[in-house]
């Protein structure tokens, strides 16, 4: 059967800081999260079956003034979807997206979402992971911050 | 045959107000809009065949100063793609996206688009609908504001 | 076999100016770029096989103050994915997205990404192309600026 995964953010373990970090805590079996013929391990989505896959990610950032004061109004809110090959230890960014934002204290609430998607050849054993900037601003809802993949066709 | 739908906004019947509303008027059979083995009824896209589907939405907001004066520069421009189960009357958000925006009167034109997409298990009889904030700012073009789904695989 | 393409920007030949232009230089056979049972010619992705396709594009814009001074802080950063039919010489926009942005000189770096995607009926011989505003601001990375398509199903 065709492999797929839809992984939603596990907000109980989101890193802090403003620099780029890899997000390692995702749900794979609750709510909208699900996985079949792929493996989720150590924060990475592992390919078990060669093929061409459509990969996607939706990342939401938000801040309410009651959460505290931002260190800077000028933010880089970014996502990077990366592929790591174990055989040849290397990591490459498949897709990136995001925006620089000016989140002023004049507004009590700020929100921003990024969506990226693309069609990629993946080999068994390769691993997909998601990196973001400003992880402490992530929206923890399952409808907000997630990534996934589904196999579309075999490699000829 | 594999079900699909691509529904484009019917701008002759867009609600007003700034709060979140469900968009019920969509085209399903003109221009780029089309549907097969799914049903469009009462503003909702109804699933006729169990399966895993890729769902997507593209929502564009725009304002020209000639359209009138905005009540606030601080806008929440959001989309929510929701699933309703008739058997168990409940509605859940599958995907959300958007941004807070500062649309100043100092600029004559403003534009912003949101895209969301994800892979979900849908059962026959379940309904997909789209909610947005600030519907009166929607771009009425068929290339701008649309949502859709296509079945990728059966449920094992 | 099911057709697909994932084309990444060829930054050696990006047009200048701020007006809408068609992007004609894309890679189809290096890095993440690939194509099968479709043709890339004269800056357009040509359909060789009738079917329903999922089309997508990810477009990143960026500016660093070291690159020079912008002519205006008020930018329209847009993408248009268009279909051209040779038999009936006409071009139609399938998908559009983007945002107006205020890129002030107070910040040394600016970034913004657009993602669009949708499901369309394509006939053999039809051509897909991508137009953007402000092409000189495009991010030239293969993970940043790309578009693609994959066939999902036949036309009944």
């Amino acid at each position: 059967a065709q492999p797929f995964a839809h992984l939603t953010i596990n907000a109980t373990n989101i890193p802090t800081g403003s620099h780029k970090v890899s997000l390692s805590s995702w749900y794979h079996d609750r709510g909208w999260a699900k996985i079949s013929n792929m493996t989720f391990s150590n924060g990475k989505l592992i390919v078990n079956q060669d093929g061409f896959y459509y990969l996607y990610a939706n990342i939401c950032f938000r801040h309410h003034e009651t959460s505290g004061d931002l260190a800077t109004e000028y933010l880089q809110l970014m996502v990077y979807v990366t592929k790591t090959s174990i055989k040849i230890p290397s990591s490459h960014t498949l897709m990136k997206g995001g925006s620089t934002k000016y989140w002023s204290g004049n507004s009590e609430f700020h929100f921003y979402s990024i969506n990226v998607g693309g069609f990629f050849k993946l080999r068994s054993g390769e691993e997909i992971s998601v990196e973001v900037s400003n992880p402490s601003l992530l929206d923890p809802d399952q409808d907000a911050t997630y990534f996934g993949a589904f196999k579309v066709r075999d490699i000829d | 045959a594999q079900p699909f739908a691509h529904l484009t906004i019917n701008a002759t019947n867009i609600p007003t107000g700034s709060h979140k509303v469900s968009l019920s008027s969509w085209y399903h059979d003109r221009g780029w809009a089309k549907i097969s083995n799914m049903t469009f009824s009462n503003g909702k896209l109804i699933v006729n065949q169990d399966g895993f589907y890729y769902l997507y939405a593209n929502i564009c907001f725009r304002h020209h100063e000639t359209s009138g004066d905005l009540a606030t520069e601080y806008l929440q421009l959001m989309v929510y793609v929701t699933k309703t189960s008739i058997k168990i009357p409940s509605s859940h958000t599958l995907m959300k996206g958007g941004s807070t925006k500062y649309w100043s009167g100092n600029s004559e034109f403003h534009f912003y688009s949101i895209n969301v997409g994800g892979f979900f298990k849908l059962r026959s009889g379940e309904e997909i609908s789209v909610e947005v904030s600030n519907p009166s700012l929607l771009d009425p073009d068929q290339d701008a504001t649309y949502f859709g789904a296509f079945k990728v695989r059966d449920i094992d | 076999a099911q057709p697909f393409a994932h084309l990444t920007i060829n930054a050696t030949n990006i047009p200048t100016g701020s007006h809408k232009v068609s992007l004609s230089s894309w890679y189809h056979d290096r890095g993440w770029a690939k194509i099968s049972n479709m043709t890339f010619s004269n800056g357009k992705l040509i359909v060789n096989q009738d079917g329903f396709y999922y089309l997508y594009a990810n477009i990143c814009f960026r500016h660093h103050e070291t690159s020079g001074d912008l002519a205006t802080e008020y930018l329209q950063l847009m993408v248009y994915v268009t279909k051209t039919s040779i038999k009936i010489p006409s071009s139609h926009t399938l998908m559009k997205g983007g945002s107006t942005k205020y890129w002030s000189g107070n910040s040394e770096f600016h970034f913004y990404s657009i993602n669009v995607g949708g499901f369309f009926k394509l006939r053999s011989g039809e051509e897909i192309s991508v137009e953007v505003s402000n092409p000189s601001l495009l991010d030239p990375d293969q993970d940043a600026t790309y578009f693609g398509a994959f066939k999902v199903r036949d036309i009944d």
Epitope: - | S18, D69, A71 | -
Partner: nanobody
Framework: EVQLVESGGGLVQAGGSLRLSCAAA????????MGWFRQAPGKEREFVTA????????GYVDSVKDRFTISRDNTKNTVYLQMASLKPEDTAVYYC???????????????????WGQGTQVTVSS
């Protein structure tokens, strides 16, 4: 709960100017759309002008365009109405009004405003 107090009204000759002020207390002023309405003797209260929460969007009734200017100072919780080239038909009680933005565009009807001041009299003599 927002309390609104108008000031600056009075008697002025035709062609003259006046500046009305409306001070707000309670609530977060920057979150409110502010408007001015007026009621002439024996007539219904009518919309004059409104200003967006941040002050960059303004709307006016046609009869006062290019003569009246609405502005606001969110640091002082105050909205102003500068009135120039006054005419006898501008004679009315002027009311300040406030509402949170429930509509995308500036509200122009009385029922869309939640809070009202007591009014200040403007009389333009010929």
């Amino acid at each position: 709960e927002v309390q609104l107090v108008e000031s600056g009204g009075g008697l002025v000759q035709a062609g003259g100017s006046l500046r009305l002020s409306c001070a707000a207390a309670g609530g977060t002023f920057r979150n409110y759309v502010m408007g001015w309405f007026r009621q002439a003797p024996g007539k219904e209260r009518e919309f004059v002008t409104a200003i967006s929460t941040g002050g960059s969007w303004t709307g006016y009734v046609d009869s006062v365009k290019d003569r009246f200017t609405i502005s606001r100072d969110n640091t002082k919780n105050t909205v102003y109405l500068q009135m120039a080239s006054l005419k006898p038909e501008d004679t009315a009680v002027y009311y300040c009004a406030a509402t949170t933005p429930a509509t995308t565009y500036l509200p122009r009807s009385e029922r869309q405003y939640d809070y009202w001041g007591q009014g200040t009299q403007v009389t333009v003599s010929s």
